[in-house]
C-alpha cells in the first residue's frame, strides 16, 4: 500500500495505490483512490509511467483528455468515470503487454489540494491449473495442466496423506511455448498415485501462485482450484 501526500501550495490530499499484476493479453486494473471532491469538474487525474514521455491517461473536467497520451497507451486506457466523484481514480488497461510493467504514478488534483502515489505494476501470465486423473496412463497417474504462464514457473506436488514428501522423483513437468511465443503451457504428471488421498499441484512464479487440488477415491474424483496474485502491496 502506497499512500502519497500532496506538497506545497494548496493543501495535500491522500492518494493510495496498490501494487498489482497484469495478465498478458487480458485487461488489467491499476488501483488508485483519493479523498473525494464534491465537484467532478474540479478533479484532475493524471497517470504517468516512469520512462515514458507522454501521459498514460488524463481525466479532467469530467472527461478524458488524451491529447498528451503516449502512443503505447493509445486506445487502451480508461478510468471509471462514474466512480471518480467518490474517489476512485483506478485505471483500466486493455490488452496488457509485457512492456506495460514498471512504476506508475497516480497524480490527483482536486479543490482540496494535490497528491500522488506510485504503483509497481508487474506483467506476466498466470492461469488456473486443472488436475485430472490420466485415464490413458499405464499406471496410477495425475495430470496437472495450466494453459498460460510467464515467466516460467516452478511446479511442486504435495499430498495430504504424505505431508512433507518430495514428489520430484515421481513427477515430470514440461513447458510448451504457446503460439504467441511468450507464454507457456504447463503440464506436470504425477505417478504412483494412491487412492483415498488429496493431491495438490502448485504452480508459482514471481507474479502469481495457483493451486489445483484433486481428491481421489475409488468411486469419484473431486477438484478445486484457486489463484493468488503475489506482492499486492498497497502504497
Amino acid at each position: 500500500l502506497i499512500i502519497g501526500f500532496g506538497i506545497s501550495g494548496r493543501h495535500s490530499i491522500t492518494v493510495t495505490t496498490v501494487a498489482s499484476a497484469g495478465n498478458i493479453g487480458e485487461d488489467g486494473i491499476l488501483s488508485c483512490t483519493f479523498e473525494p471532491d464534491i465537484k467532478l469538474s474540479d478533479i484532475v487525474i493524471q497517470w504517468l509511467k516512469e520512462g515514458v514521455l507522454g501521459l498514460v491517461h488524463e481525466f479532467k473536467e469530467g472527461k478524458d483528455e488524451l491529447s498528451e497520451q503516449d502512443e503505447m497507451f493509445r486506445g487502451r486506457t480508461a478510468v471509471f468515470a462514474d466512480q471518480v466523484i467518490v474517489g476512485n481514480a483506478s485505471l483500466r488497461l486493455k490488452n496488457v503487454q509485457l512492456t506495460d510493467a514498471g512504476t506508475y504514478k497516480c497524480y490527483i488534483i482536486t479543490s482540496k489540494g494535490k497528491g500522488n502515489a506510485n504503483l509497481e505494476y508487474k506483467t506476466g501470465a498466470f492461469s488456473m491449473p486443472e488436475v485430472n486423473v490420466d485415464y490413458n496412463a499405464s499406471s496410477e497417474t495425475l495430470r496437472c495442466e495450466a494453459p498460460r504462464w510467464f515467466p516460467q514457473p516452478t511446479v511442486v506436488w504435495a499430498s495430504q496423506v504424505d505431508q512433507g514428501a518430495n514428489f520430484s522423483e515421481v513427477s515430470n513437468t514440461s513447458f510448451e511455448l504457446n503460439s504467441e511465443n511468450v507464454t507457456m503451457k504447463v503440464v506436470s504428471v504425477l505417478y504412483n498415485v494412491t487412492i483415498n488421498n488429496t493431491y495438490s499441484c502448485m504452480i508459482e512464479n514471481d507474479i502469481a501462485k495457483a493451486t489445483g487440488d484433486i481428491k481421489v477415491t475409488e468411486s469419484e474424483i473431486k477438484r478445486r482450484s484457486h489463484l493468488q496474485l503475489l506482492n499486492s502491496k498497497a502504497s
Epitope: 486423473v133 485415464y135 490413458n136 496412463a137 499405464s138 499406471s139 496410477e140 504412483n192 498415485v193 487412492i195 481421489v216 477415491t217 475409488e218 468411486s219 469419484e220 474424483i221
Partner: antibody, heavy 118, light 106 residues
Amino acid sequence: DVQLQESGPGLVKPSQSLSLTCSVTGYSITSGYFWSWIRQFPGNKLEWMGFISYDGTNSYNPSLKNRISITRDTSKNQFFLRLNSVTKEDTATYYCARKLLWLRFDYWGQGTTLTVSS
Amino acid sequence: ENVLTQSPAIMSASPGEKVTMTCSASSSVSYMHWYQQKSSTSPKLWIYDTSKLASGVPGRFSGSGSGNSYSLTISSMEAEDVATYYCFQGSGYPFTFGSGTKLEIK
C-alpha cells in the same frame, strides 16, 4: 444391492453396428464409479472395452480404435455400448460391470451373447 | 499394454491338495485382482487388492505378490473350487486380464 443387466440383439450382420444396453439398479450411475463394458471371446479370453465415468468421461481400449462409443441416459440409469463395423471376430459374450478407480470390477451383469453372422 | 501371463494354463489337483497358480505382469502393478468363473456364468470377484478375499470366499484361498509377480493359493483343494481363475490389473491403461488358469479335480 447393485445390479447390472445387459440387453441386446443377439445377432448382428457383419459391417453393421452393434448396440447394447446396461440397466443399473441399486445405485445411480452419476453418483460414482466407472461403468464399463467387457467382452469374453469364444476361447474365453476377456477384454476390457472401455468405460463411461460417473461424470461422463470416457476411456476406451486402443485395440478398438475408433469403432467404440459408450454413452449413457442418466434419467433411465442406463449406459450403452456402440461398436461400429463389426466382424465375426466381435462374436462374444458382452458384460457390463462397475469399476473402482485403478482397482477392480466389483459388480458384473450376467452377460449377453452376441453373434456376428450373415 | 500390460500383458498378464498365467501359469499353468490348466491344472488338476486332488481333494485336500495345496494349489498355487501364478500371474506374471509385463509391467509392474500396484495391485492384482482375481476372478473365479464357472461355466456359463459371469466372472466373480474372488481376491482383490492382491490379498483380500471377496465376500463369501472361503478362507482356504489366499493371494500374494508384488510388482510383476502374483499368485493365488488354495490351501486344501475342494470340489467346489473347480473353475477358471483370471488375474486382472485395473490400474494401467488399457486394463488387462490374464488368459486364465483352468483348475480341475483329480
